[in-house]
C-alpha cells in the first residue's frame, strides 16, 4: 500500500492549491505538513512556483477565504420566525416540535436496540470462533497474540464486556494469568471501537458529513491503537498495570457489592428480548475448552428451567483423571469418580422470534445482522434528518456554542477534562461505550459537535466503560472477585495511561490529526473507509494471529522487516515535510515510487472498475439503500431507479463553485469535487417531509 494516500513533492509553499488527501484546498501552514501531497513529476520546485496543472482553475471566482472542510456547517433556518407566526402557527409549531422530539427519541431507542441486536448477530455469526481463539495455549507466552485475540474476539462478538467476562472467568479458573489477560483487555479496547466506525459508514451519502462522522468515529480507533502501540511494550517490559492493580486489590478488603445498575438495558431489553435471546455462557464454555459447548446453540430456547443437583458415579479412564484421590475408586475393573450433575428440567420456552425456528446459529446471525444494519442505518438517517430539521438557526447556535465553547481564559484547559467526565458519566448511564460513541457519531457528522470536543467525550467513554466493569467486578462471586476486579482495574489504568499520553498536551493529540487525515482520504475515496475497517480490524489481527501460531521466529521474521519499513517511511515523510534539503534529490519526494505505491488514484480506478458492475444493477427503493450503494460505488448516480437519488442528482446542479464561463463546466478540475470540497452528489435534499 501507499506510504501515504497521496505522496508527492514536499512543496515549499503551502498556500497554493494542492492535491491532497482531501483534494485541493489552500491549507494553513501547520496543516501543510499533512496535506502536501501531489502526483507531480519531479521538478525543481524550489526555484519556481508552478500553477496547478489544471490552469483552468483561474476561471474560478477564487474565494478570498476557502472553507476549511473541518469547520462546522451553518445550519440555516429556512422556516418562519416564531415572532412572525400567528397563534395557530405557534400551536402547530409546538406540536411539530413535540412530534419531532417523540420521533427522535423513538428512532434513538430503535438505534440503541439495533446496536444490541447487531452485537447478538455478531455473536451468533462469530461467537463460537471467538471462543476458540481463547482456547489457544500460546496466549500465555505471547502478548501480541493476546492483543490480536482481544481485538478479533471483541470484533466478532461486538461487545468488549463479553470478551472481558470470558477473560475474567478464565483467570478465575486459572486457565489464564492476569499477566496474559492484560494484552487481551487492550485488544478488547481496540475491538470495541469498531461499532461507531460501522455507524459512521452509514453517513456515506454526504461527503462532508461523512468526512466528519468517519473522523469522529476513528478518533476512538486511533486513540486505542496508539495507546496499545506505546503501552503494550511498556507493560511487557515493566508489568506496571499488573503490579499497580495487584497492590490495589491486595490493599483493600472488598466486600461483594451490588450489580452495576442497568439503566439503558431496562428500557431496551423488553424489545430486544422479543427479537432474540442468547445463552452467552456457551462462548465462555468454548473458551474454557468445554467440548460439549461446541455443539450447543447460542440461541436461548428455554428461559424457565428447574435445576436439580445430584451426585452420580462416572467412570474415568485412569486414576490420573480423578478430580482428587479421595474422590476416586475402583470396582475392580473400572475406575470411578463422583461427579456433581445438574439435571436441568425445561419448564417454559423463551418468547422471541427465533425460538421455534431451530435454525443454525449462522443463519439466525446472518438474518439479524442484515436486519439490524438496515434498522441501524434507517434510524441513523432519520435521526440525522430530524436533528437537521430541529438544529437550525438559533437552536443550532446555542447547542453548538454550549457543546463546543471552552471555559473563559484561565480555565479553558478544564473544558476538555469536563468533557471527559461527561463522556464517562454518560457511558456509565447507558452502560456501553459503543452506544455512547455510536450516538455521538451522527452528531459529529451533522456538525453539532466538533472532533476536538468529541475526542475528550470519547476518552471519557473509555473510562466510563471501565467503571462499569469495576462495579460488575465488585458484584461478582467470591472466587472471581479478585481476578475480575484486577482485570477491570487493568482496563481502567490502561485507559488512564492512554489519556495521559494522548490528551493533556495539545501537541500529543495525534488521534485527532490522524482521524482527520483518514476522514479526508475517506471523503475523497469512500471505499477506503471499508478498506480501513477490514485492514485494521480483521486482516492485521488475523495476520498477526496466523504468524503467532506459526511460532515467534516466523512472527519476528516477518514483523521486524514490516516495522522497519513503516518506521523508515515515517522518518522519510517527516524529513520530506520538515527539512527536505537534508535528503538526496531523489528522496525529496515519493516520485521514485510507482504511482500505485504513492497514490490511491490507481487503486480508485481498480475499485471503480470492480464496483462498476454493481452501478447499473443497483436498484434501491429508499435512501438507505442509496447510501449503502454509494459507499460501494463511490458514485452519486449509482441508483438510477431510485426517486430519492434522482432528486439528489437534480439538486446537485446549484451546488457548484461560481464560474465565469458556463462552458468550463466540462472541465472537471473546476468543480468543487476536484478541490476536495463538497461533491456534486452531496446536496442534502430531503426525500420525505417530516
Amino acid at each position: 500500500m501507499a506510504p501515504w494516500p497521496e505522496l508527492g513533492d514536499a512543496q515549499p509553499n503551502p498556500d497554493k492549491y494542492l492535491e491532497g488527501a482531501a483534494g485541493q484546498q489552500p491549507t494553513a501552514p501547520d496543516k501543510s505538513k499533512e496535506t502536501n501531497k501531489t502526483d507531480n513529476t519531479e521538478a525543481p520546485v524550489t526555484k519556481i512556483e508552478l500553477l496547478p496543472s489544471y490552469s483552468t482553475a483561474t476561471l474560478i471566482d477564487e474565494p478570498t477565504e476557502v472553507d476549511d472542510p473541518w469547520n462546522l456547517p451553518t445550519l440555516q433556518d429556512s422556516g418562519i420566525k416564531w415572532s412572525e407566526r400567528d397563534t395557530k402557527g405557534k400551536i402547530l409549531c409546538f406540536f411539530q416540535g413535540i412530534g419531532r422530539l417523540i420521533l427522535l427519541l423513538g428512532f434513538l431507542y430503535f438505534f440503541v436496540c439495533s446496536l444490541d441486536i447487531l452485537s447478538s448477530a455478531f455473536q451468533l455469526v462469530g461467537g463460537k470462533m471467538a471462543g476458540q481463539f481463547f482456547s489457544n495455549s500460546s496466549i500465555m507466552s505471547n502478548p501480541l497474540l493476546g492483543l490480536v485475540i482481544g481485538v478479533l474476539v471483541t470484533v466478532l462478538v461486538q461487545s468488549s464486556s463479553t470478551s472481558t467476562s470470558i477473560v475474567v472467568s478464565m483467570v478465575s479458573s486459572s486457565l489464564l494469568t492476569v499477566r496474559a489477560a492484560i494484552p487481551i483487555i487492550m485488544g478488547a479496547n481496540i475491538g470495541t471501537s469498531i461499532t461507531n466506525t460501522i455507524v459512521a459508514l452509514m453517513q456515506v451519502g454526504d461527503r462532508s458529513e461523512f468526512r466528519r462522522a468517519f473522523a469522529g468515529a476513528t478518533v476512538h480507533d486511533f486513540f486505542n491503537w496508539l495507546s496499545v502501540l506505546v503501552l503494550l511494550p511498556v507493560e511487557v517490559a515493566t508489568h506496571y498495570l499488573e503490579i499497580i492493580t495487584q497492590l490495589i486489590v491486595e490493599s483493600f478488603h472488598f466486600k461483594n457489592g451490588e450489580d452495576a445498575p442497568d439503566l439503558l438495558k431496562v428500557i431496551t431489553k423488553p424489545f430486544t428480548k422479543l427479537i432474540v435471546q442468547l445463552d452467552k455462557k456457551v462462548i465462555s464454555q468454548i473458551a474454557m475448552n468445554d467440548e460439549k459447548a461446541k455443539n450447543k446453540s447460542l440461541v436461548k430456547i428455554w428461559c424457565k428451567t428447574f435445576t436439580n443437583k445430584t451426585q452420580i458415579n462416572v467412570t474415568v479412564p485412569s486414576t490420573a483423571n480423578c478430580t482428587s484421590p479421595s474422590l476416586c475408586w475402583t470396582d475392580g475393573i473400572q475406575n470411578w469418580t463422583m461427579k456433581n450433575v445438574t439435571y436441568k428440567e425445561n419448564i417454559a420456552k423463551c418468547q422471541h422470534i427465533f425460538v421455534n425456528f431451530h435454525l443454525p446459529d449462522l443463519a439466525v446471525g446472518t438474518i439479524l445482522l442484515i436486519l439490524s444494519l438496515l434498522v441501524l442505518c434507517g434510524c441513523l438517517i432519520m435521526i440525522v434528518k430530524i436533528l437537521g430539521s430541529v438544529l437550525k438557526g438559533q437552536v443550532a447556535t446555542v447547542i453548538k456554542k454550549t457543546i463546543n465553547t471552552d471555559f473563559p481564559f484561565p480555565f479553558a484547559w478544564l473544558t476538555g477534562y469536563l468533557a471527559i467526565l461527561v463522556g464517562a458519566g454518560m457511558t456509565f448511564i447507558v452502560q456501553s461505550s459503543s452506544v455512547f460513541t455510536s450516538a455521538l457519531t451522527p452528531l459529529i457528522g451533522i456538525g453539532v459537535i466538533t472532533i476536538e470536543r468529541a475526542y475528550p467525550l470519547t476518552l471519557g467513554s473509555n473510562i466510563g466503560t471501565t467503571t462499569t466493569a469495576i462495579l460488575a467486578a465488585l458484584a461478582s462471586p467470591g472466587n472471581a472477585l479478585r481476578s475480575s476486579l484486577q482485570i477491570a482495574l487493568c482496563h481502567f489504568f490502561f485507559n488512564i495511561s492512554g489519556i495521559l499520553l494522548w490528551y493533556p498536551i495539545p501537541f500529543t493529540r495525534l488521534p485527532i490529526r490522524m482521524a482527520k487525515g483518514l476522514g479526508n482520504i475517506s471523503a475523497k475515496y469512500r471505499w477506503f473507509a471499508v478498506f480501513y475497517l477490514i485492514i485494521f480490524f480483521f486482516l492485521i489481527p488475523l495476520t498477526v494471529f496466523g504468524l503467532s501460531l506459526a511460532g515467534w521466529r516466523v512472527l519476528v521474521g516477518v514483523g521486524v522487516p514490516v516495522v522497519f519499513i513503516i518506521i523508515l517511511v515515517l522518518c522519510l515523510r517527516l524529513l520530506q515535510s520538515r527539512c527536505p534539503r537534508v535528503l538526496p534529490k531523489k528522496l525529496q519526494n515519493w516520485n521514485f515510487l510507482p504511482l500505485w505505491m504513492r497514490s490511491l488514484k490507481p487503486w480508485d480506478a481498480v475499485v471503480s472498475k470492480f464496483t462498476g458492475c454493481f452501478q447499473m444493477r443497483c436498484c434501491c427503493c429508499c435512501r438507505v439503500c442509496c447510501r449503502a450503494c454509494c459507499l460501494l460505488c463511490d458514485c452519486p448516480k449509482c441508483c438510477r431507479c431510485s426517486k430519492c437519488c434522482e432528486d439528489l442528482e437534480e439538486a446537485q446542479e446549484g451546488q457548484d463553485v461560481p464560474v465565469k464561463a458556463p462552458e468550463t463546466f466540462d472541465n472537471i478540475t473546476i468543480s468543487r469535487e476536484a478541490q476536495g470540497e463538497v461533491p456534486a452528489s452531496d446536496s442534502k435534499t430531503e426525500c420525505t417531509a417530516l
Epitope: 486414576t319 484421590p325 474422590l327 476416586c328 475408586w329 475402583t330 470396582d331 475392580g332 475393573i333 475406575n335
Partner: antibody, heavy 119, light 107 residues
Amino acid sequence: QVQLVESGAEVKQPGESVKVSCKASGYTFTSNNLHWVRQAPGQGLEWMGAVYPGSGDTSYSQKFQGRVTLTVDKSASTAYMELSSLRSEDTAVYFCARGLPYLGAMDYWGQGTLVTVSS
Amino acid sequence: DIQMTQSPSFLSASVGDRVTITCSASQNVGIFVTWYQQKPGQSPKLLIYSASSRYTGVPSRFSGSGSGTDFTLTISSLQPEDFATYYCQQYSRSPLSFGQGTKVEIK
C-alpha cells in the same frame, strides 16, 4: 436369595491348569462384577481379578497377569477362573464374590473351592 | 500397589468389651475401605463399606470410621458370635488389596 455356588475341590500337579466355576443365582448375573479372591491355608485374603459379566471386561492383579483367565457363560449364569502353570504355593481356597454396584466391596461370597497343588 | 496394614494381628477380649481394630493404608485411599468378618471354615462376610456405611443386616454394634490413610472398625459391645478374623480392604486403586487380618479371640 443371592447365591454363588462353586465347583468342588481339585487336586493338581505342578505345571497343570485348574478351572473353577461359580454359578450365580438370585440376581441379574450381568449387572454386577464377579471377583476372585484366594486364601492360602492360615493366610489372609488375596485378590486375583474381576470380570464384568455384562460385557466380559476383565481386570487382573499384576501378580497373576498371564496365568489367570476369567470368563463367563451368560446363558448359564456361570463364571470361570482358570489358573495355569500351577505351583505348590497356589494351594489355596478360591472364592468367587459378587461386587457391590460401582464399588470394589464384595457382598456375597461363594463357599470356596480348595485347590491343592502337589507332586 | 497399595499396602494395607492391620493392627493388632491378635486381640483378646471378653464379651461386652469395646473392641477397636485399626487399618493403615500406604497412601491416601479416601473413604474407599471395606471391613469383612471371616469365621473359620466360612466365607468372608461384608460388614462395612465406604469406610463407615454399614451393610444391610449388619448389627449396629459394628461401626467404621476414618478417611485418607487411617481407618477404624469398632465393635461397641463384643458378642460371642463376633469372635472371628476381621479384614480391611481398599478399593481406591487397582489392584484391590486386603490387610493381613486381625484375629479376635476370647480372653
